[in-house]
């Protein structure tokens, strides 16, 4: 491509030249593809609202839990077990939490009257000891409740444990009470207030609308918009039993999904509530199942700071708000249409694939001869020829050879390495069909000239008897008219080519060779046809006529312009042309690759 470009180069437009195939089958396939693709594109556009600009929801949540629970605690006082009744209200069983969560206590373990002093550890595998050697001064085990003093002391009876400095008495390692102490929390209700905003669409709304009946309770089918939820119902929705979860605690997700269509003509923006258990219900005992934490109530007794430690089991409810708001946007629509246009090319890809497959050598040689029902597919070879133009890479080694006694042309795409071109087999290439309209450009004399009596026509060249070989003709010559090459040794083999593959009459003896290639009148006409005011001296005229004769022969014998560029003229023809239009001095240069 040239380095500089003119202004006119800028104002250009390139387009592809197409082949239109009039075919019922391929037409049907094309429209089938187009209808299917168009239907899918339209369906996806409408069902997924791909014409909208979508924006994620921004949300804030506020919750209120209501309910009263009566708790029956079993306590030991002076070695006697007593049943204590107490009432728990919202302040007793809920704890302030961060983010979109709230917690409801369902069970607990109390260790009362703890103060800081020395005492034996609660007996466990890690704290039981038989001597002081089993304890270490200053040791703090992650599972322990204090710092070891290094002494092994009696805990109870004959049980000895390591002494620690800690809040004493040490909290007992025991299971959560069964059933859960606040089992009635199943009947507690929670009101969820959820405000949402789509700032990009300048739209705000909330889950509680002005006309809402605040005595309602959420039900998946009967009351799906009620923002008041009974805790037991939430667990029933997920297939869990509240009483079972209440013992060890757990985590429950309340999902609020906003799928908002903010277009005026289809406006809809209401929440959908769903529930999901978020903790691992299959957890092994060693991996701490459920949900619990400890908190303490501190007080002073006789000027000594004491505390009641409570291990709280309960359910943490996480409110997860998500969703999108969509509004019509012309840019989104254009982008979507643009992204789907390429799908319409699938029909062309598929049909091209069929044409290429059915016109392959494999089908021609292995399928069509045996399969009669596949015969109609042979038409694809015709389509393929019309659709595709095969071009051979113009390597320096590329040469085309045409023998008068062969119907095809030979392509030689290799180095000769000292072998005569006559002897190189090459690859058979079909001879291009003759375009007879080109003959109309030749002078009338060529058409009208009557056949000369006794002059053999080209068709007579196919006679079986061979012309006698002249004594000077080289070994590779089959027509008896070839001459040895004058080129250096390294390039000589390129000119060692005859007009025939098998012995016979030379093409130069044909009347058409004389009329098309050697006729000065015809060649001058062709030169003037290209340059009407051409005026040359004898020497340059001979040179121009000689090269025009080479070109005429190549076009005549090879047909295709591309092949003619790489055509090697037989020695007999080359020397006959040189004899007719000689060079006054110096050697002939021979064939040169055009690229």
């Amino acid at each position: 491509m040239p380095a500089c470009c003119s202004c006119s180069d800028v104002f250009q437009y390139e387009t592809n030249k197409v082949t239109r195939i009039q075919s019922m089958n391929y037409g049907t396939i094309k429209w089938f593809f187009h209808v299917i693709i168009f239907s899918y594109v339209c369906f996806a556009l409408v069902s997924d609202k791909l014409y909208q600009r979508k924006e994620p929801v921004i949300s804030s949540v506020h919750t209120k839990v209501k309910g009263i629970a009566e708790v029956k605690e079993e306590i030991v006082e002076n070695g006697v077990k007593k049943l204590v009744h107490s009432v728990f209200d919202t302040a007793d069983y809920t704890f302030p939490l961060q983010g979109n969560s709230f917690f409801v206590m369902t069970n607990f373990l109390k260790t009362e009257g703890q103060e800081q002093r020395l005492c034996p550890e609660y007996p466990t595998r890690r704290t039981l000891c038989s001597s002081d050697r089993g304890c270490k001064k200053g040791w703090m085990d992650p599972q322990s409740k204090g710092i070891q003093t290094g002494r092994c002391v009696v805990y109870e009876g004959n049980q000895k444990t390591c002494e620690v400095s800690a809040w004493c008495p040490i909290e007992a390692v025991e299971e959560a009470p069964r059933p859960a102490l606040l089992n009635s929390a199943e009947n507690f209700t929670v009101l969820i207030k959820n405000n949402i905003d789509f700032p990009g669409h300048n739209y705000t709304t909330r889950n509680i609308l002005p006309g809402l009946n605040i005595t309602c309770t959420f039900h998946k089918t009967q009351n799906p918009q009620c923002p008041i939820f009974r805790l037991g119902d939430i667990f029933r929705e997920t297939g869990d039993n509240f009483s079972d979860v209440a013992i060890q605690g757990g985590i429950m997700g309340i999902e609020i999904y906003w799928d908002c269509n903010l277009d005026r003509w289809f406006h809809h923006c209401r929440p959908k509530y769903s529930f999901r258990r978020l903790d691992d219900k299959t957890t092994n005992v060693s991996l701490y199942p459920g949900y619990n934490f400890r908190y303490a109530k501190y007080y002073k007794e006789n000027n000594v700071e004491k505390r009641t430690l409570i291990k709280v089991f309960g359910i943490r409810f996480d409110i997860l708000v998500f969703g999108t708001g969509g509004k019509f946007d012309i840019i989104q629509l254009v982008v979507y249409i643009g992204s789907t246009l390429s799908y319409f090319g699938l029909a062309a890809v598929f049909i091209d694939f069929l044409i290429d497959t059915y016109s392959s050598n494999c089908c021609r040689s292995h399928i069509y001869p045996w399969c009669k029902c596949c015969q109609p597919c042979v038409v694809n070879e015709y389509y393929y020829r019309k659709k595709c133009e095969s071009i051979v890479e113009p390597k320096p080694t590329l040469k085309y050879v045409s023998f008068v006694d062969e119907s095809h042309i030979r392509m030689v795409n290799q180095q000769l390495l000292g072998r005569s071109l006559q002897d190189v087999k090459g690859q058979e290439v079909p001879r291009p069909a003759m375009d007879f309209t080109d003959l109309s450009r030749l002078p009338l004399a060529l058409h009208d000239t009557p056949p000369i009596p006794g002059q053999p026509e080209e068709i007579q060249l196919l006679r079986k008897e061979a012309t006698p070989r002249s004594r000077d003709s080289p070994v590779w010559c089959q027509c008896g008219s070839c001459l040895p090459s004058q080129l250096p040794e390294s390039h000589r083999c390129l000119e060692e080519l005859c007009c025939r593959k098998k012995p016979g009459a030379c093409i130069t003896t044909s009347e058409l060779f004389r009329k098309l290639v050697l006729s000065r009148h015809v060649l001058q006409f062709l030169l003037l046809y290209q340059e009407p005011l051409l005026a040359l001296d004898v020497d340059s005229t001979n040179s121009r006529l000689r090269h025009c004769a080479y070109r005429c022969y190549a076009t005549w014998r090879f047909g295709s312009q591309d092949m003619a560029d790489f055509a090697i003229l037989p020695s007999c023809c080359r020397w006959r042309i040189r004899k007719e239009f000689p060079k006054s001095e110096g050697q002939y240069s021979g064939f040169k690759s055009p690229y």
């Epitope: 595998r125 890690r126 039981l128 000891c129 038989s130 050697r133 089993g134 304890c135 270490k136 040791w139 085990d141 992650p142 599972q143 060693s286």
Partner: nanobody, 129 residues
Framework: EVQLVESGGGVVQPGGSLRLSCAAS????????MGWFRQAPGKEREFVAA???????DYGDSVKGRFTISRDDAKNTVPLQMNSLKPEDTALYYC???????????????????????WGQGTLVQVSS
């Protein structure tokens, strides 16, 4: 769950040697601290030797310098090499295992029988002339 089987016990003369072996079943053997304890008739169970999952060892005062504990995690075995045996070494020798999956047993606790959850049936060692 780990099953432990002791072997190698028998009668030996004072000053002689014996090699006890404890074979454990279970794929998580390498996560267990292993110990040897012994109980002579009419006496309390006594600590002999132990080896943690990461290879640290501890020996009872009466066997230090004479007994050697090791472990082969590939074969799931814990051998106890007993040299210079004395008549007072006569006892029923037990193999024990302590789970260290959720936390290593501190070295100073390896001798505590309370640390060990799993116990073998025992193998008898008799030292007499």
């Amino acid at each position: 769950e780990v099953q432990l089987v002791e072997s190698g016990g028998g009668v030996v003369q004072p000053g002689g040697s014996l090699r006890l072996s404890c074979a454990a079943s279970g794929r998580t053997f390498r996560h267990y601290a292993m110990g040897w304890f012994r109980q002579a008739p009419g006496k309390e169970r006594e600590f002999v030797a132990a080896i943690s999952s990461y290879g640290s060892t501890d020996y009872g005062d009466s066997v230090k310098g004479r007994f050697t504990i090791s472990r082969d995690d590939a074969k799931n075995t814990v051998p106890l090499q007993m040299n210079s045996l004395k008549p007072e070494d006569t006892a029923l020798y037990y193999c024990a295992a302590a789970d260290e999956t959720l936390g290593a047993v501190p070295n100073f606790r390896l001798h505590e029988k309370y640390e060990y959850e799993y116990w073998g049936q025992g193998t008898l060692v008799q030292v007499s002339s």
